[in-house]
Interface confidence: low
């Protein structure tokens, strides 16, 4: 399965939206930080078989476009950006799900890492608990936001190993 | 072949405890985690928790933090579930049930403990 | 949580008759981890259907599963006897999981 350049440039359109969606200075919300414990050792790569490490990636594009399709987050940025945003995850799910049959054939349903998925779901519920805790606040939303960016740098840098496996 | 084992019933009286086990056998288990669910008589099932056998993590339902404890023995590959202070309303069917992706989730069940609560 | 309502809670069938079980969720769920399980009475439920439309090992081809975001089905084209049980639908789309109430599906 080849990630493509196509898919390269996906990832970093993906964060650029990221990036242009910040509304306030991260500075104004310090007090607001919180350790989400993102799951780092899921992404370090090495221990995965191929089709686990796209499984992974996959959950973590689903779980962040389930997280900003929410009414909460349509409130709280701006539309046209959404809109993108939606539409470069969804093209990158997309080409997650043609590699993972393209690598285990789609009849089988590769040993994917449980663990490694159910630790991603619950990065994410924790990021959903601290938003109700915070009542949606803009500060709230801005801590989420560069978390789900440092989250996406993660899986992009995986993806670049994928590719280099190629 | 996958088997997960569990004693047929257990009477216990209102306000003790009881431990229910599940032996696994036919696959490698600390490389899956391993479910609990209940089912009361004639009506749905409740998910209760879940703990890898790995490393001992669990993870629970909000509404059994404070009436079910998960643990697994890793030298007797057999997970166990504790359940206190008992009431009527905890009489059921407990069962186990192996995780895993894809159609490998919940492919896998005991065939259930009667659990009943009576004086 | 997701609340997953299913209906009907009963129904009967006639040997050859089309029947439609559904699933409701409270929020929409990710349809890869919508699941459906059969059970018979004294017994463990047996997985059915995964990831909303995929048949698991075993299970006749006259049955099948769709739908998408909060609304999923099970649909057996030609009811036979030994369909009769209850079904239950399943989401491990986000925590805590959870099963619907159940369906029990009789032969007239």
């Known amino acids: 399965c080849n990630l493509s350049q196509t898919h390269s440039l996906n990832n970093r359109r993906t964060l650029m939206l990221m990036a242009q969606m910040r509304r306030i200075s991260p500075f104004s919300c310090l007090k607001d930080r919180h350790d989400f414990e993102f799951p780092q050792e899921e992404f370090d790569g090495n221990q995965f078989q191929k089709a686990q490490a796209i499984s992974v990636l996959h959950e973590m594009m689903q779980q962040t476009f389930n997280l900003f399709s929410t009414k909460n987050s349509s409130a709280a940025w701006d539309e046209t950006l959404l809109e993108k945003f939606y539409i470069e995850l969804f093209q990158q799910m997309n080409d997650l799900e043609a590699c993972v049959i393209q690598e285990v054939g789609v009849e089988e349903t590769p040993l994917m890492n449980e663990d490694s998925i159910l630790a991603v779901k619950k990065y994410f519920q924790r990021i959903t608990l601290y938003l109700m805790e915070k009542k949606y606040s803009p500060c709230a939303w801005e801590v989420v936001r560069a978390e789900i960016m440092r989250s996406l740098s993660f899986s992009t840098n995986l993806q670049k190993r994928l590719r280099r496996k190629d | 072949q996958v088997q997960l084992q569990q004693p047929g019933a257990e009477l216990v009286k209102p306000g003790a405890s009881v431990k229910l086990s599940c032996k696994a056998s036919?696959?490698?288990?600390?490389?899956?985690?391993m479910h609990w669910v209940k089912q009361r008589p004639g009506q749905g099932l409740e998910w209760i928790g879940e703990?890898?056998?790995?490393?001992?993590?669990?993870i629970y339902n909000e509404n059994f933090k404070s009436k079910a404890t998960l643990t697994v023995d890793k030298s007797s590959i057999t997970a166990f579930m504790q359940l206190s202070s008992l009431t009527s309303e905890d009489s059921a069917v407990y069962f186990c049930?192996?995780?895993?992706?894809?159609?490998?989730?919940?492919?896998?069940w005991g065939q259930g403990t009667l659990v009943t609560v009576s004086a | 949580q997701i609340v997953l309502t299913q209906s009907p809670a009963i129904m009967s069938a006639s040997p050859g008759e089309k029947v439609t079980l559904t699933c409701s969720a409270g929020?929409?769920?990710?349809?890869?981890?919508l699941y459906w399980y059969q059970q018979k009475p004294g017994s463990s439920p047996k997985l059915w259907i995964y990831?909303?439309?995929n048949l698991a090992s075993g299970v006749p081809a006259r049955f099948s599963g769709s739908g998408s975001g909060t609304s999923y089905s099970l649909t057996i084209s030609s009811m036979e006897a030994e369909d009769a049980a209850s079904y239950f639908c399943h989401q491990w789309s986000s925590y805590p999981f959870t099963f619907g109430s159940g369906t029990k599906l009789e032969i007239k």
């Open positions: 036919g696959y490698t288990f600390t490389n899956y985690w």
């Open positions: 990831s909303t439309s």
């Open positions: 929020s929409s769920v990710d349809s890869s981890y």
């Open positions: 049930a192996r995780g895993g992706l894809g159609p490998a989730w919940f492919a896998y």
């Open positions: 703990i890898n056998p790995s490393h001992g993590r669990t």
